[in-house]
């Protein structure tokens, strides 16, 4: 059975909800509208998912194929160092802030970008196939 933490490795469950894209063992939602970082996070949480936490360079490269020049919010924030929403540090890529207000992370086809969390951007949610299901 698939159940437990959103951040765990998902089992190969068969399908994703409408308007979600299945890639590997996860479902991804690429928004059409734009929101600030906090509103994007709330959107994902309300759908038993989380703002995109990228596990490694391979996942990042694969996802960038689906992205354009437009930046999308991901689950990355600078709280005394850049960390993913699951608490893990960013250690496979670089991101730098050009001002003190740039404390949220975004991604486009070219890579990661620090931004003010207030900027309205597209966002990406990630979850396991079927709501709130992950491998223990």
């Amino acid at each position: 059975l698939c159940q437990g933490s959103n951040y765990s490795t998902c089992a190969s469950c068969p399908s994703c909800p409408d308007r979600w894209m299945k890639y590997g063992n996860h479902c991804y939602y690429f928004s059409v509208e734009e929101k600030d970082w906090n509103s994007s996070l709330e959107f994902c949480l309300a759908r038993d998912s989380h703002l995109l936490v990228i596990t490694d360079n391979q996942e990042m490269s694969l996802l960038q194929v689906f992205l354009s020049e437009a930046f999308c919010w991901i689950g990355l924030r600078n709280n005394s160092g850049w960390r993913w929403e699951d608490g893990s540090p960013l250690n496979f890529s670089r991101i730098s802030s050009n001002s003190f207000v740039q404390t949220c992370g975004a991604i486009n086809k070219n890579g990661l970008q620090a931004s003010s969390c207030e900027v309205p951007l597209h966002w990406v949610c990630k979850k396991c196939p079927f709501a709130d299901q992950a491998l223990f």
């Epitope: 600030d36 930046f71 802030s97 050009n98 001002s99 003190f100 207000v101 740039q102 975004a106 970008q113 620090a114 931004s115 003010s116 207030e118 900027v119 309205p120």
Partner: antibody, heavy 120, light 107 residues
């Protein structure tokens, strides 16, 4: 084309008040931090105030803190600077400026400026 | 507060010359530096951010370099329209401080 047009400058007595406006066009105003920068006659540039996208966060140097208030109306695409307890040293051309995007707080676009003269 | 000091404060040069303006920060600001050009009676014009990245539409004869505390703005071959005052600015944190300016005049 990005356009920033300041207004509201003029002659005011020391201790007086004045409100400057900056009308923005050619970009989505509600996506950008905005700032005021001033230049006293024959002098260099001095940053005066910055406001966040929502208006919830404002920033000032010590020289104007408590006397100047920056605000914005995203529905009207307008930035404001309320200046009170004005002093002779506040005499300057006041420029409205837009950041570079994503909270990159360099001053990428500038208005033409409005002159504020504080004199009795 | 971080202080920005430019040198020289004024400079005379001729069309075609290579010119370098220096900006020094009172402490390490990494690459958080912008450059602006201002002509008399006009608003400043944005030239460079992050110490070396040219703003859109800025001619390639302008270049920026440096990191930490020492930065330079170089104009490789002066054009008549380049005679102006140049300012550096720290853009990471509060207060956003400017250098005092360098006035570039025709020799």
């Amino acid at each position: 084309e990005v356009q920033l047009v300041e207004s509201g400058g003029g002659l005011v007595k020391p201790g007086g008040s004045l409100r400057l406006s900056c009308a923005a066009s050619g970009f989505t105003f509600s996506r950008y931090y905005m700032s005021w920068v001033r230049q006293a006659p024959g002098k260099g540039l001095e940053w005066v105030a910055t406001i966040s996208i929502s208006g919830g966060n404002t920033y000032y140097p010590d020289s104007v803190k408590g006397r100047f208030t920056i605000s914005r109306d995203n529905a009207k695409n307008t930035l404001y600077l309320q200046m009170s307890s004005l002093r002779a040293e506040d005499t300057a051309v006041y420029y409205c400026a837009r950041e570079g995007g994503y909270g990159n707080l360099w001053f990428a676009y500038w208005g033409q400026g409005t002159l504020v003269t504080v004199s009795s | 507060d971080i202080q920005m000091t430019q040198s020289p404060s004024s400079l005379s040069a001729s069309v075609g010359d290579r010119v370098t303006i220096t900006c020094r920060a009172s402490e390490n600001i990494y690459s958080a530096l912008a450059w602006y050009q201002q002509k008399p009676g006009k608003a400043p014009k944005f030239l460079i951010h992050q110490a070396k990245t040219l703003a859109e539409g800025v001619p390639s004869r302008f270049s920026g370099s440096g990191s930490g505390t020492d930065f330079t703005l170089t104009i490789s071959s002066l054009q008549p329209e380049d005679f102006a005052t140049y300012y550096c600015q720290y853009h990471y944190g509060i207060p956003f401080t400017f250098g005092q300016g360098t006035k570039l005049e025709i020799k």
